[in-house]
């Protein structure tokens, strides 16, 4: 029998390599059984996760899972960093793994590094 606890499906140590100026949607996949929980995004600052209050978010519903989306329109260099989503469920706070955005500000698409290069060249990142 599947658990009816809320589950947040962000992979541990997940990373996204994205380009400043582009739109980007950061998804927090949420599984729940009955009432949809209240979900928020925060950005890690050292060991503290600072709640993102005034950011555009939305829900996308699919058959077996819902997605709480943090919108970047557009991505800015200072969006670089690690993010976490959290759900309030029956007075419990459930936290996802953090996911890291690596933002690069190259001038043209032809200069964009590959995902592998992004992972191995942190000096490219803001």
């Amino acid at each position: 029998k599947e658990s009816c606890d809320v589950q947040l499906y962000i992979k541990r140590q997940s990373e996204h390599s994205i380009l400043a100026g582009d739109p980007f949607e950061l998804e927090c996949p949420v599984k729940y059984c009955a009432n949809r929980p209240h979900v928020t995004w925060c950005k890690l600052n050292g060991t503290t996760c600072v709640k993102l209050e005034d950011r555009q978010t939305s829900w996308k519903e699919e058959k077996n899972i819902s997605f709480f989306i943090l919108h970047f329109e557009p991505v800015l260099p200072n969006d670089n960093g690690s993010y976490r989503c959290s759900a309030n469920f029956q007075s419990n706070l459930i936290e996802s793994h953090s996911t890291t955005l690596y933002v690069t500000d190259v001038k043209s698409a032809s200069e964009r590094p590959s995902k592998d290069e992004m992972a191995s060249r942190p000096w490219l990142l803001y």
């Epitope: 589950q7 947040l8 499906y9 962000i10 992979k11 541990r12 997940s14 990373e15 996204h16 390599s17 060991t47 936290e95 793994h97 953090s98 995902k115 592998d116 992972a119």
Partner: antibody, heavy 119, light 112 residues
């Protein structure tokens, strides 16, 4: 039934390349990280790197950076390891392993495929 | 890179007796999420590795409860409470807290 089946091993000339496949079934590859690990005869396990099939992000051990490429095709539930500039010391059994990325709920290993680098 | 050092390199234990394998990491494996990503793998002769234990002490499904894992920070232990003939294998610890992920050198468990 969960399965990881590696293929593509065999005899390769020094300086040559190989591309190994890891066909998975019984789970959604996008929910996992795919690792490639090798083991020379009578030796221990050596981590080559890992791929996130959900977005293509890849990490490598330093000794394989620039020489190894790990990728995945989630539509085929299959992962790949390409290794270039092969040397005799690359002779080993190559394993793929699939570890669930969210809650560590499973960690499956394939049976391995033997690669022999020799002239 | 994090160095994982297992002891002993080999171990001979009588059937029904307790077997203990140690694994020491060169730095803490405690992740920033408060969890410790330390696995134990079993590799029987001629077979591929199999995950026995993850997150230091959680047993994979189907793993007999004579296996247990313990430890924290940099020091970890795999214990087999009552050795069975089918436990003859090489055991590896593996950390996947810090990149690059690294294995211990392995401990060969033999029947005395």
């Amino acid at each position: 039934e969960v399965q990881l089946v590696e293929s593509g091993g065999g005899l390769v000339q020094p300086g040559g390349s190989l591309k190994l496949s890891c066909a998975t079934s019984g789970f959604n590859i996008k929910d996992t990280y795919i690792h490639w690990v090798r083991q020379a005869s009578g030796k221990g396990l050596e981590w080559i790197g890992r791929n996130d099939p959900a977005n293509g992000n890849t990490k490598y051990a330093a000794s394989f950076k620039g020489r190894a490429t790990i990728s995945a095709d989630d539509s085929k539930n299959t992962a790949y390891l390409q290794l270039n500039s092969l040397k005799t010391e690359d002779t080993a059994v190559y394993y793929c392993a699939s570890y669930e990325g969210y809650y560590e709920r499973f960690g499956y290993w394939g049976q391995g495929t033997l690669v022999t680098v020799s002239s | 890179d994090i160095v994982m050092t297992q002891s002993p390199d080999s171990l001979a234990v009588s059937l029904g007796e307790r077997a203990t394998i140690n694994c020491k990491s060169s730095q803490s494996l405690l992740d920033r999420d408060g969890k410790t990503y330390l696995n134990w793998l079993q590799q029987k002769p001629g077979q591929s590795p199999k995950r026995l234990i993850y997150l230091v002490s959680k047993l994979d499904s189907g793993v007999p409860d004579r296996f247990s894992g313990s430890g924290s920070g940099t020091d970890f232990t795999l214990t087999i409470s009552s050795l069975q003939a089918e436990d003859l294998a090489v055991y590896y610890c593996w950390q996947d807290t810090h990149f690059p992920y690294t294995f211990g050198q392995g401990t060969k468990l033999e029947i005395k």
